[in-house]
Interface confidence: low
């Protein structure tokens, strides 16, 4: 009956911890005889190929100093410790503490035996380390030009991390790799970059971070700070006011960010009827007259710029009885 | 032992707003994005959408709109916003761990009819 | 959208191996889990991340993947294995986040 070496093909370790290589013989043959079981890189120098042995009365051996005994441990092979004992060496599961970079690459275990001589299997082991993930918006000021809006930055990953981002703006994502202060490491940071405008300010978007090491991807929201000159619109008219009417304002209506320091009111014209009050963001009128047949101006300013808005008022002689709202406000 | 649990499923008439709330055992809500899906009568399994860690909502293109997620420390809630007769359904709230599903809990029956 | 296609019904004699496939019409970066229905019950995950068998699971159920069809393989299939089965998959694109269910395949065993 054939025997084999049942490996995994890969197996993962963290960065710093300890991981387990399982090796076994298999099936279990009465009366075969297992001489060795031994633990190889096959890609290493020569001299550091034979990482660990183990012999069925003498017991484990490491050879190599990397990674060195301190650092290696069988699981669960046992030797013979007299005439009544037999030696296990079916399981040559191998373990490896406090693992570094340099750890990663092809382990074979072997073994010889009789009479079917030596049968061995491969396992790759690959080092990983969890990267630590953070995101924050950067405060940007309004232009026509592409701008870093938020950054997402996940660091000392093994391998890199995958960032990608989850919004409905209009977006690209620029991204750089530098090594991280833990040898083997990357630190990804992608830059979530569009032309900012008042239309992003407080938008949540979401940093979404994929890594080996996460049971599930990471996501991370972040709200956007965008400071904009004021958006201005003015509401309160109603294609209604007539000469003499006394319950008519005008409001000028404001996004901006930060907010406004100041409201202006004017009218294109120049003249500015004696009856129109401007109170803050508010142009309330005690009575009309035909001095507002006229296009009355809101300018807001802010720490950012300036925006205004402009309404065109039409004076009636008389009320407009025709399905007019009541809307002057 | 981890369990999740659905509740406020009922009759209700179209355009009567339902909520559903999902209740956790043996582990925190808090710590888990949480999912809904839903089973109508002899389909199979549709998910709505799903609430993260951070307490953003991401919903299935058909199913903006018409539902909200939200949760607090201890529940997760569905909302649907004006139930139609095609919304009949078993509603299902899971743990989303990993690249799937990996904690259900029993289902609630959701009946919409005039 | 994306979709994932399924077998409506699949036929498998007890004792016998069958392979169950989820074909999505894109390719997806994204990886493929498995869910066991049985009438009046939840799902329960059986497969994630194409390969990955949850603790409690019998190693009778095993995924695969290549191309855009992950396959569930139940070995060995038992009585007990009557069910639905969905296989779903993230949709993640660059402005949107959602799963996707495929349409399940109600698998009877004979004999």
């Known amino acids: 009956q054939d025997v084999r070496v049942q490996v995994l093909p890969e197996v993962r370790g963290q960065l710093g911890g300890t991981v387990e290589l399982p090796c076994h013989l298999l099936p279990p043959v009465p009366g075969l005889y297992i001489s060795l079981v031994t633990w190889q890189r096959p890609d290493a120098p020569a001299n550091h190929q034979n990482v660990a042995a183990f012999h069925p009365k003498m017991g484990p051996s490491f050879p190599s100093p990397k990674p060195g005994s301190e650092r290696l441990s069988f699981v669960s092979a046992k030797q013979s410790t007299g005439q009544d004992t037999e030696a296990e060496l079916q399981d040559a599961t191998l373990a490896l503490h406090g693992l570094t970079v340099e750890d990663e690459g092809n382990y074979t275990c072997e073994f010889a035996t009789f009479p079917k001589g030596s049968v061995r299997g491969m396992t790759w082991l690959r080092v990983i380390a969890k990267p630590k993930n953070q995101a924050e918006a950067q405060k940007v000021t309004f232009s026509q030009d592409p701008t870093t809006v938020a950054l997402c930055i996940s660091k000392e990953g093994r391998p890199p991390a995958r960032i990608s981002w989850l919004s409905s703006l209009d977006w690209e994502a620029k991204e750089t790799q530098v090594s991280g202060t833990l040898a083997g490491t990357v630190t990804v940071t992608s830059r979530f970059t569009l032309v900012p405008s008042g239309r992003a300010d407080g938008v949540t978007v979401t940093c979404k971070v994929e890594h080996e090491s996460f049971e599930e991807p990471a996501l991370i929201p972040v709200t956007l700070s965008v400071r904009y000159p004021p958006e201005v619109s003015i509401s309160g008219y109603d294609d209604n006011w007539y000469l003499g009417r006394t319950d008519a304002t005008l409001s000028c209506d404001v996004r901006s960010n930060p907010e406004p320091t100041g409201y202006d009111w004017s009218t294109t014209s120049g003249t500015f009827p004696t009856s129109a009050v401007a109170q803050g963001s508010q142009l309330v009128i005690h009575a009309v007259d035909s001095l507002f047949n006229t296009t009355f101006v809101c300018t807001v300013t802010n720490a950012v710029g300036m925006g205004r808005a402009e309404q065109v008022i039409f004076v009636r002689e008389t009320p407009n009885t025709a399905g007019a709202g009541a809307t002057g406000g | 032992q981890e369990q999740l649990e659905e509740s406020g499923g009922r009759l209700v008439t179209p355009g009567t707003p339902l909520t559903l709330t999902c209740t956790a055992s043996g582990f925190s809500l808090s710590s888990y994005h949480m999912s809904w899906v839903r089973q109508a009568p002899g389909k199979g399994l549709e998910w709505i959408g799903l609430i993260n860690t951070g307490d953003s909502a991401y919903y299935a293109s058909w199913a903006k709109g018409r539902f909200t997620i939200s949760r607090t420390s201890t529940t997760v809630d569905l909302r649907i916003t004006s139930p139609t007769t095609e919304d009949t359904a078993t509603y299902f709230c899971?743990?989303?761990f990993g690249d799937g599903f990996n904690l259900w809990g029993p289902g609630t029956l959701v009946t919409i009819s005039s | 959208s994306f979709v994932l296609t399924q077998p409506a019904s699949v036929q498998v004699d007890l004792g016998q191996t069958v392979s169950l496939t989820c074909t999505a019409d894109?390719?997806?970066?994204?990886?493929a889990s498995w869910y066991q229905q049985k009438p009046g019950q939840a799902p329960v995950l059986l497969i994630y991340r194409d390969t990955s068998r949850p603790s409690g699971v019998p190693d009778r159920f095993s995924g695969s993947s290549s191309g855009n069809t992950a396959t569930l393989t139940i070995s060995g299939a038992q009585a007990g294995d009557e069910a639905d089965y969905y296989c779903?998959?993230?949709?993640?694109?660059?402005?949107?986040?959602?799963?996707?269910f495929g349409g399940g395949t109600q698998l009877t065993v004979t004999g």
């Open positions: 779903a998959t993230e949709d993640s694109g660059d402005s949107s986040y959602q799963y996707v």
């Open positions: 899971a743990r989303t």
């Open positions: 894109t390719l997806s970066r994204s990886y």
